[in-house]
Interface confidence: medium
């Protein structure tokens, strides 16, 4: 003989009874009548349950809650089912024998029968687990029933403290749906808050769990499938203030089937969201977006921001969001960088594009622009890179595409090529009034549109000139000299320790800023416009350190222990970390800081000039850094202001050395035996480049690299080509992660080396 | 006078081992990579192996690589080459060479400045 | 690493011009832009004369310029001299803390 062996299945549910009605008391659990109520209504499930075949299986039950409307009672029960047969009784098959015993003409005196008349249509069965029960139990000392009427906002009030862990039960209208708001109002916190697409923290119904005060996302609104929902908040410290602001709606449910008819032309025409967008969407969410395009001359491009598509085994859900395009089934996953699907028009014109969300975990709400593209060339002058559908640069010696195809099969890599007999040159060369090749190709087309390309400048009419660099040389090039617009930069004022480096003399470096906090000099930084500093966004990582109002900016400084009449000091009123950055990878490190108030410039307060993004530094060349970083590896910030040049390194040296760890949006400069180099404290400040017409150009932002000064490896900069349309974008008011901005990180404040 | 000179050539048997030195002088040796090339009887130049000028930084050529060690002493101005398990194909006239410019963080991979070179034969 | 390919000889008249070719892969002469030519005469140790494909070390005769097309790069001489022939080597760097050279082309000034 041998024991049967068993195991506990837990479920969840809920049930509605008819001629019994919710009061304000059956909504306090430690209300007499809870009480009275709870264990009557606990006898009736066990005898539904005991009436049934799952009756011989019976172990223990609860009703732990009661709702609104025709009384809903909430409730869990434990079945020790034979290991055999686990499988064999999922929620549904459950459901259906208790529906059928509530149905049936049974002549039973039991009080589910007699008592109360349950509604076999509300009745509700989810799978639920023993730790899903000890999470309910350790909540109901804080156990909060609230039914969310049409129109009104709930504030939902912490944890006291006396209790760690709070549970809400939030109810609704049955054709509304539950939206709970969460706002964050401290820098610090161990909180957690974990929201259930049930009325119990059930993990399988789990939308979305937060830990810490997420500077990524200051403000979250979180959408339940339906008109229930479960919030848990479990404090982590002990604490007088709650460091976040709850509060919960009921909305209608939003619609998202579209048709959309696209224009010929190849701008962006529009966008595709998820309900209630930047909202997380929801567990139910089905949106299917059907665009049709003019012609099949073109394909149809989808923009994606910080969330990529890729293709998943179909055993495989997907976690976050289930997209369809053309009988294609794609998974969503969020990323940390841009990416574009672009859909090929074939046979016909029109695409359904259809997004699920396949479990109750969710995420941010999706936003996706569209766009057309020409099919016979999606690029014009760059490449198509398929890994990620962007167009990049091609072989100007910069590994844009995750599988290096760009840089592939190049014929000239960073240098221009003779259209007579394919040789290269270098691009300073080209448009110098001076032949290079063979029969003057590099002279050719110096004064009239070309077609755009890597190197090609681009202005503001969007036609392209060939010679490179044209901004601010003092020659118009472009039809509508936009090449010699917003020219007041990168002149220095008054004259003509960052490691290895000499002291700057006042107005050398009218761009420079100094980034304090109490008084005490953090980062560095530049002027690029007369409200706007740029700088490393790695400056911001730590909790301490996340609010603009901690910062000072000090422009034309010269000293740290002491003032001088060039010198300004400004407030921080906004901050923008570019959305992309990647603590861990130091990619994406810029930052952008609106002052306060605007800049009067002087011959010790300018802006640097911003560089194009088809701006070439040429390897080789000598730039300059300043800051006032320390003058040795571990030492102390410097004083003065230091300056030292640097020369700029080829990428592929640079990432050999680094083991490939250097991104597309970075640069290398320094030495082979280092010596001379950024270091702690010169964090965001500058690397400038002098370009011919005597203007300083602003190449790079000092961002990381392996010790200071350490032979064998040089310093690493934020490239400022690869982020300058951003930069532009949050310049002109086009957003970008304002306020908070990027992740919720923990690091040093300032030049990361290692 | 910028001036290399190779020695520690000679005839030997195969399997065995040799030491190459290379002395610089007229010049700041810790400030250039440094590098050996061969070449056997008419034949063309053979790149062996490079060091960069603070010993942190080693390549070599397929052929001699797990064999050959490349090694440099920057106090006394010397760069050496230990050969072992030495092959009849090693046979051949050994320069050493310096890496043209001592400024940049990368090389230019290119030799400015030679020696005379050191002939190793390999033979039974 | 497989050697970069050269012409074994290429000639010249006194006073003409001579381009000498040296194919390389993608990974080599076709990625990096560290192309070097060196020049030798016999018994000789070799002298560079071109180096970043089309960079002249002071004291190497304007005459001398170098190219490069794809993963091939070239070396041309202009106004052939007496003095010019001699045997000349192309180099490349190939990734990895590794050099490559040509197999060489003799270079022969006629009459």
């Known amino acids: 003989y041998k024991a049967e062996v068993t195991v506990s299945q837990v479920y969840s549910g809920s049930l509605r009874v008819l001629n019994r009605h919710f009061s304000q008391d059956l909504g306090r659990r430690e209300s007499i009548a809870f009480r009275s109520e709870s264990a009557k209504a606990q006898k009736m499930l066990q005898e539904l349950v005991a009436s049934t075949r799952l009756g011989t299986y019976y172990n223990s039950s609860s009703v732990y809650s009661f709702g609104e409307g025709p009384l809903t009672c909430f409730f869990w029960f434990i079945l020790d089912i034979p290991e055999y047969q686990r499988l064999t009784l999922s929620p549904e098959v459950v459901r259906e024998l208790l529906v059928d015993e509530l149905l049936s003409n049974s002549s039973t005196l039991a009080s589910y029968k007699t008592e109360y008349e349950v509604d076999p249509e509300g009745l509700v069965i989810l799978e639920a687990s023993v730790n899903d029960i000890v999470v309910l139990n350790s909540t109901l000392g804080c156990y909060r029933y609230s039914y969310v009427n049409p129109g009104q906002v709930l504030p939902l009030k912490g944890p006291d403290q006396q209790t760690t862990s709070c549970l809400w039960h939030l109810q609704g209208p049955e054709d509304l749906m539950i939206k709970v708001r969460l706002e964050w109002t401290r820098v610090d916190c161990r909180d957690r808050v974990a929201m259930y697409d049930a009325a119990g923290p059930l993990e399988k119904r789990l939308i979305t769990s937060v830990y810490g005060c997420s500077r990524q996302e200051p403000v979250m609104e979180v959408l339940a499938s339906g008109s229930v929902m479960a919030v848990v908040w479990k404090k982590g410290m002990h604490s007088y203030y709650d460091p976040f602001l709850l509060s919960v709606k009921s909305v209608a449910f939003q619609d998202c089937q579209v048709n959309l008819t696209l224009e010929g032309r190849l701008d962006t025409q529009g966008f595709l969201r998820t309900p209630y967008y930047p909202s997380y969407y929801s567990p139910s969410t089905h949106c299917s977006w059907h665009l049709t395009v003019p012609s099949l001359d073109y394909g149809l491009a989808l923009w994606f921001d910080a969330y990529a598509l890729r293709r998943q085994k179909y055993n495989r859900l997907c976690t976050q969001g289930q997209w369809m395009i053309q009988n294609r089934r794609l998974c969503g996953f969020r990323t940390l960088q841009p990416y574009a699907e672009r859909i090929p028009m074939v046979a016909s014109d029109g695409v359904t594009i259809n997004f699920t969300s396949q479990i109750s975990l969710t995420g941010p709400g999706v936003q996706v622009y569209y766009s057309l593209y020409n099919q016979s060339d999606p690029c014009p002058g760059e490449f198509l890179c398929s890994v990620n559908g962007l167009c990049v640069p091609a072989c100007d010696g910069i590994k844009d595409c995750p599988n290096g195809l760009d840089e592939r099969n190049c014929v000239c890599r960073a240098m221009f090529q003779c259209q007579e007999d394919s040789t290269c040159i270098s691009l300073p060369r080209v448009c110098d009034r001076q032949p290079d090749c063979l029969n003057g190709s590099d002279e050719e087309q110096c004064q009239e549109g070309v077609p755009c390309g890597t190197f090609t400048f681009q202005c503001e009419d969007r036609s392209c000139v060939k010679k490179p660099n044209p901004e601010c040389d003092g020659q118009s090039d472009c039809r509508d000299g936009s090449d010699e617009q917003h020219c007041d930069c990168g002149l220095q004022g008054l004259s003509s320790r960052i490691v290895g480096g000499t002291v700057s003399s006042e107005g050398e470096w009218p761009w420079q800023a100094s980034l304090q906090i109490r008084g005490r000099h953090i980062c560095g930084g530049a002027l690029i416009a007369d409200r706007w500093v740029i700088t490393a966004a790695h400056c911001f990582q730590e909790d301490s350190m996340a609010s603009p109002k901690l910062w000072t900016v000090f422009l034309g400084k010269m000293r740290q222990n002491s003032r001088w009449p060039g010198e300004v000091s400004f407030k921080v009123s906004r901050l923008f970390l570019h959305p992309y950055h990647e603590e861990d990878s130091h990619d994406y490190d810029v930052a952008l800081l609106q002052l306060d108030h605007p800049v009067v410039y002087s011959a010790t307060v300018r802006p640097v000039c911003l560089p194009a993004r088809s701006h070439f530094f040429e390897p080789g060349q000598h730039c300059w850094i300043t800051g006032w970083g320390a003058q040795r590896e571990g030492g102390p910030v410097s004083n003065t202001l230091q300056k030292v040049d640097v020369q700029l390194v080829p990428q592929d040296l640079c990432s050999e050395a680094y083991r490939y760890q250097v991104s597309p949006r970075m640069l290398c400069a320094g030495y082979r035996k280092g010596k001379k180099d950024a270091c702690q404290g010169d964090s965001g400040g500058p690397l400038v480049c002098r370009e011919p017409s005597g203007r300083w150009f602003l190449a790079g932002l000092v961002s990381w690299g392996l010790g200071c000064g350490r032979p064998n490896f040089f310093g690493v900069y934020t490239r400022v080509t690869r982020v300058i349309n951003w930069i532009q974008q949050v310049l002109t008011g086009g957003g970008g992660s304002g306020g908070g901005g990027s992740h919720h990180h923990h690091h040093h404040g300032s030049h990361h080396h290692h | 006078e910028v001036q290399l000179v190779e020695s520690g050539g000679g005839l030997v048997q195969p399997g065995r081992s040799l030491r190459l030195s290379c002395a610089a002088s007229?010049?700041?040796?810790?400030?250039?990579?440094m590098y050996w090339v061969r070449q056997a009887p008419g034949k063309g130049l053979e790149w062996v192996s490079g060091?960069?000028?603070?010993?942190?930084?080693?390549g070599y050529a397929d052929a001699v690589k797990g064999r050959f060690t490349i090694s440099r002493d920057n106090a006394k101005n010397v760069l050496y080459l230990h050969m072992n398990s030495l092959r009849p194909e090693d046979t051949a006239l050994y320069y050493c060479?310096?890496?043209?410019?001592?400024?940049?963080?990368?090389?230019?991979?290119?030799?400015?400045?030679w020696g005379q070179g050191t002939t190793v034969t390999v033979s039974p | 690493q497989s050697a970069l390919t050269q012409p074994p000889s290429a000639s010249g008249s006194p006073g003409q011009s001579v381009t000498i070719s040296c194919t390389g892969t993608s990974s080599d002469v076709g990625f990096y832009n560290f192309v070097s030519w060196y020049q030798q005469h016999p018994d000789k140790a070799p002298k560079v004369m071109i180096y970043e494909v089309s960079k002249r070390p002071s004291g190497v005769p304007d005459r001398f310029s170098g190219s490069k097309s794809g993963n091939t790069a070239s070396l041309t001489v202009s106004g052939l001299q007496a003095e010019d022939e001699a045997d000349y080597y192309c180099?490349?760097?190939?990734?990895?803390?590794?050099?490559?050279f040509g197999g060489g082309t003799k270079l022969t000034v006629l009459g």
């Open positions: 060091i960069s000028w603070n010993s942190d930084t080693i």
């Open positions: 180099s490349s760097y190939a990734g990895s803390n590794k050099v490559v």
């Open positions: 060479a310096r890496e043209k410019d001592g400024d940049f963080y990368y090389n230019y991979f290119v030799m400015d400045v």
């Open positions: 007229g010049f700041t040796f810790d400030d250039h990579v």
